[in-house]
Amino acid sequence: MMTGTIETTGNISAEKGGSIILQCHLSSTTAQVTQVNWEQQDQLLAICNADLGWHISPSFKDRVAPGPGLGLTLQSLTVNDTGEYFCIYHTYPDGTYTGRIFLEVLESSVAEHGARFQIP
């Protein structure tokens, strides 16, 4: 039975040209995290594997940095980076947990972070 929950940074906004950290945290389970995949809509951005470490998709290498932790740092943001991001936790023995983050990249210098929220 899957008892865990994923906490994410929720709905966030950032300035064009700036950076943002995408963070998810799996709690309420003792399951072993074997791998975390990060996706943007239908594109694989990066993978962090317990044995192999990080793999950043070549097309994102210039603008995506691993970490902190199992999170992902997006750099040199453009308005095209606006959209949904997913952290997919592969765990044993529970299975897969998915968290969602919505990022809005703003032209203006006013960019506020949304509150943290839970995805069951």
């Epitope: 791998q35 996706e39 239908d42 594109q43 044995d51 192999l52 592969h90």
Partner: antibody, heavy 118, light 107 residues
């Protein structure tokens, strides 16, 4: 240099058993998921089974579930496929493949032919 | 199970031609799509992984695109050594499934 070398193929009668081995070298075997993929004569590729690295969780195609068992011995850098209750339709070249991040298969062995016939 | 449909099943082309092979998944697979090349009597060789990432050592004339359900493998200028069979494969979920293959033959 990454190398995968399959062995154990041969001719077996229907209902018989066979154990395939895949000897790995040139990489840290225990860190990678591994798969078996087969190809019947003149046909396309068919995934057979996979085994994860750290947890050794196993996954099977419906066509072999309950008959085949994938396993690994990290101390020997070897992947296995135990095949029981073999059928004529299991006749194929069997390849082992390395599966980084369980997303792609970047290195393949040369294959070993299994023929099931009376 | 996710079905992978490749088209065409075979094609004839000349050296220097631009060749496009398509692969369609029966449901969205994000970008968990790989392309392999296989020559007779040989093991498959990884060309493209995660829909668009070129595997190390593979010539840049090979490229992949697409996401969701529709994917494309393009060979920008066909070379003599490219005559082979090409397979797509999804790794979104088990059972892992391959397309039926596209045989690229000399015209």
């Amino acid at each position: 240099e990454v190398q995968l070398l399959e062995s154990g193929g041969g001719l077996v009668q229907p209902g018989g058993s066979l154990r395939l081995s895949c000897a790995a070298s040139g990489f840290t075997f225990s860190s990678y998921a591994m798969s078996w993929v087969r190809q019947a004569p003149g046909k396309g590729l068919e995934w057979v089974a996979s085994i994860k690295s750290s947890t050794s969780s196993t996954y099977y195609a419906d066509s072999v579930k309950g008959r085949f068992t994938i396993s690994r011995d990290n101390s020997k850098n070897t992947l296995y496929l135990q095949m029981n209750s073999l059928r004529a339709e299991d006749t194929a070249v069997y390849y082992c493949a390395r599966e980084p991040y369980s997303v792609w298969m970047d290195y393949w062995g040369q294959g070993t032919l299994v023929t099931v016939s009376s | 199970d996710i079905q992978m449909t490749q088209s065409p099943s075979s094609l004839s082309a000349s050296v220097g031609d631009r060749v496009t092979i398509t692969c369609r998944a029966s449901q969205s697979i994000s970008s968990y799509l790989n392309w392999y090349q296989q020559k007779p009597g040989k093991a498959p060789k990884l060309l493209i992984y995660a829909a668009s990432s070129l595997q190390s050592g593979v010539p840049s004339r090979f490229s992949g695109s697409g996401s969701g359900t529709d994917f494309t493998l393009t060979i920008s200028s066909l070379q003599p050594e490219d005559f082979a069979t090409y397979y797509c494969q999804q790794s979104y979920s088990t059972p892992l499934t391959f397309g039926g293959g596209t045989k690229v033959e000399i015209k």
